[in-house]
């Protein structure tokens, strides 16, 4: 390590008046003052890597990446980025510190990522490595699409006041249920704004930016289709568009549909129908009932009725704020060490939540499912067995949601042992929480039979990452016992383990693991 | 040059509420991300880590101090503050803030710069 | 929380002489393991990170080992300026740890 060179790696960030073009520079601009970011070397590597601490910057800052070098004689570089070589020019300071700069002007997605800088100097070669990425700023947003008739034309188009300006695109599928999961070959996508085929089975519309993506159904009511046990159930904020369409299939054109909120036909200019015949000659009729902008007086069951068909209804709830409903209490699972066992959590929300599971402070991909009766359900199943604190975070622009679990694994206990000068303790994490016993081993008791009660202190404690409880014993020791070997013994419903300890010995000193079943 | 420099009282009284601030000077917690930790030292005996800020405001505290302590950070100001309820005369120690680097890689050096500390004594 | 257990809690010892310490975790902690440097009324000082790899610009003469429960840090030959306290420091789980210390006193 003696001939590696002492590195600084700081940022600038630079007012955003400049007019400095290039990417790679030796002279940076006038700018705030540089801020070390605790550049050091790489553990467990292969080569000497430097990382500097990860750089967050917002959308359209003007940064330069600097690294000082302390070493003798010259250094020669490359910047790479994306693999791409980027050009670069070392020079030197007063201090006759090597100086690498890298400018970024207008930081923009593309220019995020991983810069790696490396230098060769006349002892050593080494690698700095940089990761930039913008900050989330309110800049950039993703909203949920929405539905507006297309002047004088039957057709739909799809709206979603995102930034940056977001593709958007229908997706359309024609089968029934499960087949109209998104990767499935009945699905289309077609990247445009404006829709014309507006009789099929199921369509969505969706956003999507560096944000991520948003989508919006077509809420459906098909006068063909067995009515669902529970009234299906529309929630939109005041202020929102409401759209449902009805659709009814017959075998010719005689018939008619109709859309009544609360037994009193909907106001022209609230409605518009489309018919069209299908391939078997068959006639499909769709009845769209759309408000620009709900309010308060928009609720109640819109009930669309033909006279070929029996009526269905949906109950449009309007709110004034979005909601997450479901049970926030605790909930604590034990299970077997090869159990399957998921977490599941059920609630209704709008708009549309977003969602994590969280352990030891790592997040994994939340993915919800629609059940029938207008509630959703998330759940998680990648614990990996791993007791401790689960939780689940829910989110939409309205309402957030916490729910804690608690996992406990079936275990037997292993024992861990240590003694002090004082002390001799014992830890275990077996679950259920072990009990303890101390034994003697002498020449009367070989076989450390003769238990200890004197001087036994036991607890449980919290291991604050995981959640988890561990069980510790601790012997104090006394004039009797010291010199002696001591056994410490964990047992639950699923076991014991013990630990053999000599009680003169000043470090930890676990002289041998005894596993007994 | 990178300095963390703590300011507090030096004397507190005991129930007191004792609040320290940690300024920091050569990094900032907008652009770089960096965590702070609390540590303290009472006279002649060992280091006791107290609570740690991360850079998304994540925080973590002592098991035996976690009903007292409160860390918070003010990104504009470039600040860190500590406080700890209920003082008493075992909490007199000398209270240090040091910085740890968050790499995107994930491994961690724990803290590389220090203050020089701040001396608090609590008595009545 | 998890135990730091550091040997011995104090030496003596002359210029030259080759010093080591020693840490104990009650679990396994991987490499999350520091070594800092103290001297009376200054601050701690970060000699060895990630268990084994010296802190930039600190003498070579210090080196660290060790991953999971046992760790050990070396001053293949100790100077005057070596004088001081040492501690470990696992951060690993929270609450994060230090050990109690060692002294390394003038023989």
């Known amino acids: 390590n003696q001939d590696l060179p002492v590195i600084k790696c700081v940022l600038i960030n630079h007012k955003n008046n400049d007019s400095s073009v290039g990417k790679s520079s030796s002279y940076p601009m006038v700018s705030e003052s540089p801020e070390d970011l605790g550049c050091a070397l790489r553990p467990q590597s292969s080569g000497t890597v430097y990382e500097a601490a990860a750089v967050e910057v917002d959308v359209s800052a003007s940064i330069t990446l600097q690294v000082l070098v302390d070493a003798p004689g010259n250094i020669s570089c490359l910047w790479v980025f994306k693999h791409s070589s980027l050009n670069c020019q070392p020079h030197f300071d007063l201090q006759n510190r090597g100086v690498v700069s890298m400018v970024i002007l207008k930081m923009t997605e593309t220019q995020a990522g991983e810069y790696l800088l490396f230098i060769q100097s006349e002892a050593t070669n080494y690698t700095i490595l940089f990761t930039v990425s913008i900050r989330n700023t309110l800049l950039y947003t993703l909203r949920r699409p929405y539905f507006r008739k297309m002047e004088n034309q039957d057709a739909l188009v799809c709206i979603s006041e995102s930034v940056p300006e977001p593709i958007v695109e229908w997706v359309l599928c024609d089968s029934q249920g499960e087949s109209c999961k998104e990767e499935s070959p009945a699905v289309v996508k077609k990247e445009e704004k404006v829709l014309h085929e507006l009789f099929g089975t199921d369509i969505r519309c969706c956003a999507r930016n560096e944000l991520g993506r948003e989508c919006t159904r077509l809420f459906t009511i098909d006068l063909n289709q067995t009515p669902q046990t529970t009234l299906p159930q529309l929630f939109l904020k005041v202020g929102e568009p409401l759209w449902i369409r009805c659709k009814a299939v017959h075998v010719n054109h005689g018939f008619g549909l109709t859309w009544e909120l609360e037994n009193k036909a909907l106001e022209e200019g609230n409605y518009f129908e489309m018919s069209t015949y299908s391939t078997n000659r068959t006639m499909i009729r769709i009845l769209f009932a759309f408000v620009s902008s709900v309010a308060r007086n928009d609720t109640g069951y819109y009930t669309c009725s033909s006279s070929k068909h029996p009526s269905q209804s949906a109950l449009v709830t309007i709110v004034e704020k979005g909601f997450i409903n479901a049970t926030n209490s605790s909930e604590d699972y034990e299970i077997d060490q090869y159990e399957e066992f998921c977490f599941s959590v059920r609630f209704k929300a709008y708009p549309q939540i977003r969602c994590t599971w969280t352990f030891s402070r790592k997040s994994f991909p939340c993915e919800q499912k629609g059940l029938d009766n207008g509630y959703s359900i998330s759940k998680f199943c990648n614990h990996k067995h791993q007791p401790g604190e689960y939780i689940f975070h829910a989110e939409n622009d309205d309402a957030q949601f916490t729910k804690m679990f608690t996992l406990n694994i079936r275990r037997k206990p292993q024992v861990l042992a240590e003694a002090s000068a004082s002390q001799a303790s014992c830890f275990s994490d077996g679950y259920p929480l072990p009990s303890w016993t101390w034994k003697k081993c002498s020449d009367k008791s070989p076989n450390c039979t003769e238990e200890i009660t004197e001087g036994v202190w036991n607890r449980k404690a919290n291991r604050k990452v995981f959640g988890q409880w561990v069980s510790s014993s601790t012997l104090n020791m006394s004039e009797a016992i010291k010199g002696f070997l001591v056994k410490c013994c964990a047992y639950n419903s699923l076991g014991t383990s013990c630990e053999t300890i000599l009680l003169n010995s000043p470090g930890p000193f676990p002289f041998i693991q005894d596993n007994i079943s | 040059q990178v300095t963390l420099k703590e300011s507090g009282p030096a004397l507190v009284k005991p129930t007191e509420t004792l609040t320290l601030t940690c300024t920091v000077s050569g990094f900032s917690f907008r652009n770089a991300r960096m965590g702070v930790s609390w540590i303290r030292q009472p006279p002649g005996k060992a280091l006791e880590w107290l609570a740690h800020?991360?850079?998304?405001?994540?925080?973590s505290y002592s098991t035996s101090l976690k009903s007292r302590l409160t860390i918070s950070k003010d990104t504009s100001k470039s600040q860190v503050v500590l406080t700890l309820t209920n003082m008493d005369p075992v909490d007199t120690a000398t209270y240090f803030c040091?910085?740890?680097?968050?790499?995107?890689?994930?491994?961690?050096?724990?803290?590389?710069?220090w203050g020089q500390g701040t001396m608090v004594t609590v008595s009545s | 929380d998890i135990q730091m257990t550091q040997s011995p809690s104090s030496l003596s010892a002359s210029v030259g002489d080759r010093v080591t310490i020693t840490c104990r975790a009650s679990q396994d902690i991987g490499y999350d393991l520091g070594w800092y440097q103290q001297k009376p009324g200054k601050a701690p000082k970060r000699l060895i990170y990630a268990a084994s790899t010296l802190q930039s610009g600190v003498p070579s003469r210090f080196s660290g080992s060790g991953s999971g429960t046992e760790f050990t840090l070396i001053i293949s030959s100790l100077q005057p300026e070596d004088f001081a306290t040492y501690y470990c420091l696992q951060h690993n789980s929270f609450p994060w740890t230090f050990g109690q210390g060692t002294k390394v006193e003038i023989k």
């Open positions: 800020i991360f850079s998304n405001d994540e925080k």
């Open positions: 040091a910085r740890m680097p968050e790499y995107s890689s994930g491994w961690s050096g724990a803290f590389d710069i």
